[in-house]
């Protein structure tokens, strides 16, 4: 049940009066604000709407809104020496030229400073040679090249269609199997749903559209010049040299007409299987090389994009909390886009605006949350989260002792079809109550409770009747928040009903025809997807700023630590006689675990009786729930990964979009039957075992009876 | 040491199945490609398809139409080729082999189709 | 489909002598050709790769040569053991093709 106890309340001014105020049509105007003109990033379009947005937060009637500018790395292509990629016969001339800009979409002719397709952070290159086509890039399709198709990429540029995982990732696989170059291409299997035309008549990528991206490995760091500390005036900045994540290889994005005249050439070896071919009109050969006749064609790269450190602004409004304005709950998403920014992320911008104006507007009722609400619009998340992670080690010190939660608010959409919710277990049950009390925006569950149809469409895995709430892993603002703080974290949106495709985007992510109009004729014409986001994403927001017991359960935490114990423990399995040998136990994780489940369910008893009109015990009740996430925390970080300090869950190491559960034992684990010292590798997993079950045996502990 | 263990011989009539194991060890089975190879009385190598253990993903040979189907059970490692509406024609020795390059096979499984 | 054609049918070679076969392919599949070993009463064994490496633990008599369409197994010093059916394969393209074998006999 919702709460309403902050102070000058009057009856009205709950969560209702809040939730009532949230209008689709508000929502609507503000993104076509938004999508106008192009918002990269470091530029001054993106600069002018800071300053917009900061002017009308103040309007809308917060507390005070401030820019915080940092300077980071960024990157952009050359203005006078494009980039791309072509085929050259056998006395270097060019046969083919990949184009070196999106036709742009209609109504857009005349926009300037539509930044052409590039890979962020590439170095510069021009490399030439045989190409390779590696599927996906992932790490079991360079397993699947190198060990048992026998093919080195050593010296070769590789070929990947962009998909299933982080496109940072797929460039670090291709660095590691020693390749020169990397070409990354939308296949129309991936980007093309059948059925569907293709962008302005529909909202499919046309073969001339292009994914931008950056294709770093930063593990967490922020800007690459400044790791753990932000990137303020009297900054030291690490040379070039010693940048975090980096690529060592010239990368560039192409779109599907272009890989055609690359991939109709490939000879080689034919394709492993099925799951390796796309859709294009192609045989999908792996190479290395072109075919017969196109045998002494080579494929040469010219990439010339400059790194260069650059001014960001971030806005952060607060709006101060009556009773406890030292506790804050986050709601923050980004406002820099690779171009109009129509989905990502101007439809989570067009989002947090209207809560900010519902909340304003209650606060010029005379309301005010309990706990402090900060509203940022943070730069640069396309280049790295650079804004969000910057701030967060600005304010590192406040955020680790003050920090309740962190909702995040990019992309509001990438799909129509039910909600989808990433999120710490702590929130699962504020999650479920919260949309069981919105109506469903959803054809055929008119009437319907949100929790219904998203139940409907996208059910439990485990728990039947429940609907499905993944881990979070990263890949976006939250990042910092979660996996470096530990600050309890959640994000949700609409999305599409294509699980097999998660992590791939909508067909035209990151491209020029990311436009306002893509989603006001193709996805939501009445903005009631957005309206039910902004429902669950504000009232994530007023519950855990106003609850006067923070509405979070550590019982959900307990039962997903079983799962996933489990689940570790089945992957450990699968050696059973290398753990005979190494004597690699489990028993002290399950035993920390077992711990964890009974101090929470007492903890969950004394929550229900203790005396709430106390405010010393409500605070000290209400702070071993939002340090719980933080006692997650090993400070010295994972192994690698210093900034990636969460123990129960990490981004994927194979993909950065991906949440993994118990990462250090997983990342130990994996791949292990290939390791040259067995010793020492089941060591390493011995150690991360015992890491994983201390941490979990000091958590349970914080939930313990004080004295 | 890498060892692919098949099923013992088969006799079937004309219009049966015949679903054919091959129990993997000795390596990472999701890693290797699994092909199933057959080979007539004293005749040439004819290759009927294949599947990536770790995905499921697989190619067929055309000639089979639909005819054969395979299929792995990782948590066993074993891969298995199963061929329907068999013929007088289908007998032969049935091979797995592990790897792209066929770098390992199994003992081969006689399929005699008589009527 | 692309057809292997292998020559000689087969081939009778005096112990320590050389023996040539030749795989040819209906059309270009660059180096994408293996050669196996079939032993009487055996499975076939995996000898060459990518149309010249060897495979792990064959002797270096064996060698792999071509591209292209044409390509040859040479075995430089024949030995009793090495008595079987070699077979050439293609992987360049779906279905994947085997020639109808070369079987080298001692003279």
């Known amino acids: 049940k919702s709460s309403n106890e902050a102070t000058n309340i009057t009856p009205k001014h709950n969560m209702k009066a809040f939730l009532d105020e949230l209008k689709a049509e508000n929502i609507k105007k503000f993104l076509y604000n938004f999508t106008q003109i192009p918002h990269l990033a470091g530029t001054e379009q993106n600069f002018q709407l800071a300053k917009q947005i900061q002017s009308q937060w103040k309007e809308f009637g917060l507390d005070s809104v401030e820019l915080a500018h940092y300077d980071v790395l960024l990157s952009y292509p050359n203005k006078t020496h494009p980039n791309y990629i072509s085929i050259i016969n056998e006395d270097g001339n060019e046969i083919f030229n990949t184009s070196l800009f999106e036709p742009p979409p209609p109504g857009y002719e005349n926009v300037s400073d539509i930044v052409p397709p590039f890979s962020a952070f590439s170095p510069q290159g021009m490399p030439e040679g045989d190409l390779v086509y590696v599927n996906y890039a992932r790490t079991e399709d360079f397993f699947k090249l190198e060990r048992d198709m026998k093919i080195n990429c050593s010296g070769k540029i590789v070929i990947a269609r962009y998909g299933k995982v982080f496109r940072g990732n797929k460039v670090k696989n291709a660095q590691l199997a020693g390749a020169k170059g990397v070409i990354l291409y939308s296949d129309p299997a991936d980007y093309f749903a059948p059925g569907v035309k293709s962008y302005p008549d529909g909202w499919n990528l046309p073969g001339g559209g292009v994914q931008r991206g950056n294709i770093l490995n930063l593990n967490g760091a922020g800007d690459p010049l400044t790791p753990g500390y932000p990137a303020n005036e009297y900054a030291y900045r690490r040379g070039i040299a010693e940048a975090v994540g980096l690529p060592s290889i010239p990368v560039h994005p192409i779109g599907y007409y272009d890989a055609q005249k690359l991939l109709e050439k490939m000879g080689g070896s034919a394709p492993p299987d099925s799951s390796w071919r796309g859709s294009l009109k192609v045989p999908y050969n792996v190479g290395p090389g072109f075919t017969g006749n196109f045998s002494t064609q080579k494929v040469k790269m010219h990439i010339h994009s400059t790194n260069e450190v650059t001014r960001i602004y971030n806005v952060i409004g607060t709006l101060r909390g009556a009773v406890e304005p030292d506790r804050y709950v986050i709601l923050g998403g980004h406002r820099d886009s690779w171009v109009f920014g129509g989905i990502d992320p101007q439809s989570g911008a067009a989002v947090v605006h209207e809560i900010v104006r519902s909340f304003g507007t209650l606060k010029k009722e005379g309301w005010r949350p309990r706990r402090t609400i900060l509203f940022a619009s943070w730069d640069a998340e396309e280049f790295g989260l650079l804004g969000s992670t910057e701030w967060a080690e600005e304010n590192s010190r406040l955020l680790q002792e003050r920090g309740v939660a962190y909702i995040n608010a990019d992309s509001s959409i990438e799909g129509n079809y039910t909600l989808r919710v990433d999120c710490t277990p702590l929130m699962y049950s504020l999650v479920h109550n919260l949309t069981k009390e919105l109506k469903s925006p959803d054809e055929g569950f008119e009437g319907k409770s949100l929790y219904e149809s998203w139940t409907k469409k996208s059910p439990s895995p485990e728990f039947s009747g429940m609907p499905r709430i993944s881990k979070l892993g990263s890949g976006n603002d939250f990042e910092v928040f979660f996996q470096r703080l530990g600050i309890a974290s959640g994000r949700a949106r609409y999305t599409k009903n294509w699980e097999t495709n998660k992590f791939s985007g909508y067909p035209l992510y990151h491209s020029v025809y990311e436009t306002y109009e893509l989603v006001e004729k193709f996805y939501d014409p009445m903005f009631k997807y957005h309206l039910t986001v902004a429902q669950v994403r504000g009232g994530m927001v007023f519950e855990l700023a106003n609850s006067i017991v923070l509405p979070f359960d550590c019982r959900d935490y307990a039962v997903v630590l079983r799962k996933y114990a489990d689940k570790i423990y089945s992957i450990s399995m699968k050696h059973p006689q290398e753990m005979k040998t190494y004597s690699v136990s489990f028993d002290s994780l399950f035993s920390a675990v077992k711990n964890f489940t009974e101090i929470a369910s007492k903890f969950s008893e004394r929550l229900q009786d203790f005396d709430k009109s106390n405010p010393i015990v409500l605070r000290m009740m209400n702070d071993q729930l939002m340090f719980l996430e933080r006692a997650f925390i090993d400070p010295l970080g994972l192994p690698d990964r210093p900034f990636y300090r969460h123990v129960i869950y990490a981004p994927s190491s194979h993909n950065k979009y991906a949440g993994e559960s118990f990462p250090g034992i997983y990342d130990a684990l994996f791949d292990i039957e290939s390791k040259v010292d067995p010793s020492k590798a089941w060591g390493e997993v011995k150690r991360q075992i015992y890491v994983a079950a201390f941490t979990v045996q000091a958590a349970a502990e914080t939930l313990s009876e004080v004295a | 040491e890498v060892q692919l263990v098949q099923s013992g011989a088969e006799v079937k009539k004309p219009g049966a199945s015949v679903k054919v194991s091959c129990k993997t060890s000795g390596y990472t089975f999701t890693e290797y490609t699994i092909h199933w190879v057959r080979q007539a009385p004293g005749q040439s190598l004819e290759w009927m398809g294949n599947i990536n253990p770790n995905n499921g993903g697989t190619t067929y040979n055309q000639k089979f139409q639909g005819r054969v189907t395979i299929t792995v059970d990782k948590s066993t490692s074993t891969a298995y080729m199963e061929l329907s509406s068999l013929r007088s024609e289908d007998t032969a020795v049935y091979y797995c082999?592990?790897?792209?390059?066929?770098?390992?096979w199994g003992q081969g499984t006689l399929v005699t189709v008589s009527s | 489909d692309i057809v292997m054609t292998q020559s000689p049918d087969s081939l009778a070679v005096s112990l320590g002598e050389r023996a040539t076969l030749s795989c040819r392919a209906s059309?270009?599949?660059?180096?994408?050709v293996d050669w196996y070993q079939q032993k009487p009463d055996q499975s076939p064994k995996l000898l060459i790769y990518?149309?010249?490496t060897r495979h792990t633990g064959v002797p270096d008599r064996f060698t792999g040569s071509g591209s292209g369409t044409d390509f040859t197994l040479t075995i430089s010093s024949l030995q009793a053991e090495d008595v079987a059916v070699y077979f050439c394969?293609?992987?360049?393209?779906?279905?994947?093709?085997f020639g109808a074998g070369t079987k080298v006999e001692i003279k």
């Open positions: 394969q293609q992987r360049n393209s779906y279905p994947l093709t």
């Open positions: 082999a592990a790897g792209w390059n066929f770098d390992y």
């Open positions: 990518w149309a010249s």
């Open positions: 059309q270009d599949v660059g180096t994408a």
